[in-house]
Amino acid sequence: SSPCPQAWGPPGVQYGQPGRSVKLCCPGVTAGDPVSWFRDGEPKLLQGPDSGLGHELVLAQADSTDEGTYICQTLDGALGGTVTLQLGYPPARPVVSCQAADYENFSCTWSPSQISGLPTRYLTSYRKKTVLGADSQRRSPSTGPWPCPQDPLGAARCVVHGAEFWSQYRINVTEVNPLGASTRLLDVSLQSILRPDPPQGLRVESVPGYPRRLRASWTYPASWPCQPHFLLKFRLQYRPAQHPAWSTVEPAGLEEVITDAVAGLPHAVRVSARDFLDAGTWSTWSPEAWGTPSTGTIPKEIPAWGQLHTQPEVEPQVDSPAPPRPSLQPHPRLLDHRDSVEQVAVLA
């Protein structure tokens, strides 16, 4: 058997670090057998059999010029083997980021924090952590480790399925190369990394006969499990065309009637979602949808941009329980849907 331990990586390749002493091992001889070393294609003897180093070649302070193929020969001139030297660095701890689009699964991605220049693979696993004692804040790795299955297509990503929303997990991502291994441990709680996908199917429709109203509706993201005990809340933003500032409201359900649209102008609308108990963060915004209020009686005079102007809208009369409020600035609730006198918000 070969006296040379096979490092992880392609066969016949041995590894070293720039600036460090490197030992090459002749694979086809018995340990300690004296050999001669040559660079492939070069007749010059690098190290003779009388060096006292047996089957090894020592390169002091290796640099990039030392990379390449070496040949070792036994005393009788027989080929002891060929060795390719590749230089690089030991792994550094990878950088890891985890995210969850629902409350049952999460994924972790990683990236090297330093390129080693050597063949590299990643080992991924996780443990579930539990609290020690009812009043104790201490946590201990308790169950596992289990493998965190990696994407089959080679993306730097692994997924934990069937996670517990209230548990904490410790993710282990270990970068391995022929010169060693380096581990990043990351503590993750599903609650803190939860970020739903944006709502889907956003539609914006005019409300016939109401020149300052738009009805927006949407659905839960497809990735959100259909169970009633984990709901989403929503944030909706809208603005007239060519206006830079968004107005923001938090609708109660899966639709919202905007009552202060600018008559005659198209409006952009977008929605975002978040766990209804404020776990994690808001989703990214949905793609914008556009809608224009239905035509109605337009006020005779549209004031200059930058002024707020209110005009009654020609529409059926309904009892109005409270005076209307313009929604130029973000506020938690929109105008009461029954308001009979609506605002024409003319925005700068």
Epitope: A92, V95, Q114
Partner: antibody, heavy 118, light 107 residues
Framework: EVQLLESGGGLVQPGGSLRLSCAAS????????MTWVRQAPGKGLEWVSS????????QYAESVKGRFTISRDNSKNTLYLQMNSLRAEDTAVYYC???????????WGRGTLVTVSS | DIQMTQSPSSLSASVGDRVTITCQAS??????LNWYQQKPGKAPKLLIY???NLQTGVPSRFSGSGSGTDFTFTISSLQPEDIATYYC?????????FGPGTKVDIK
């Protein structure tokens, strides 16, 4: 010569924007994580943001999250920091620093001063 | 975030004195602790990495020790050129944090 050279600092009003650059030379820029660290006048060092060699993962201090964006162009050996919605408390010397790894800084630039004032 | 504390905040010592600075982390950081020197008007310089490893080219009078939450930085024989502020910094977390610094000057 192995070095980092920051540029792009200056005086800006609160709410304004600035883009810092850091030109790297003398080492294989694309192999290393890069970082911005800042130092307010007369104060200590504060880590701002880091980015991995491939540029696909970034990290930010809570104080700048959502306002600053770190990026890199490995073909130009350059690191960037886009700073938006600047505040008076962002006034500092901004240093660019190189790995090894993530979170150790073995090479620093000279720094560029950013002053946020009306 | 992991909080770092340093003591003392400043010290005066004579040339040739042994100088010791301590750094404490708010939680276990293994040995992921670096020490930096910053001279007035200059950028910081890495002296010690991973608690006890001397950075290439740094004089051997500088040393570091410790693990877990408690760390020590030592200048075995203070030299005039060592006047500076010294910072510890953890990188156990992916959000590195620095200590507040210790200003060292000559008596």
């Amino acid at each position: 010569e192995v070095q980092l050279l920051e540029s792009g600092g200056g005086l800006v009003q609160p709410g304004g924007s600035l883009r810092l650059s850091c030109a790297a030379s003398g080492f294989t820029f694309s192999w290393y994580s890069m970082t911005w660290v800042r130092q307010a006048p007369g104060k200590g060092l504060e880590w701002v943001s880091s980015i991995v060699p491939y540029g696909d993962l970034t990290q930010y201090a809570e104080s700048v999250k959502g306002r600053f964006t770190i990026s890199r162009d490995n073909s130009k050996n350059t690191l960037y920091l886009q700073m938006n919605s600047l505040r008076a408390e962002d006034t500092a010397v901004y240093y660019c620093a190189k790995g090894p790894g993530w979170g150790s800084f073995d090479l620093w630039g000279r720094g560029t001063l950013v002053t946020v004032s009306s | 975030d992991i909080q770092m504390t340093q003591s003392p905040s400043s010290l005066s010592a004579s040339v040739g004195d042994r100088v010791t600075i301590t750094c404490q982390a708010s939680q276990d950081i293994n040995n992921y602790l670096n020490w930096y020197q910053q001279k007035p008007g200059k950028a910081p310089k890495l002296l010690i990495y991973d608690a006890s490893n001397l950075q290439t080219g740094v004089p051997s009078r500088f040393s570091g020790s410790g693990s877990g939450t408690d760390f020590t930085f030592t200048i075995s024989s203070l030299q005039p050129e060592d006047i500076a502020t010294y910072y510890c910094q953890q990188h156990e977390s992916q959000s590195p944090t620095f200590g507040p610094g210790t200003k060292v000057d000559i008596k």
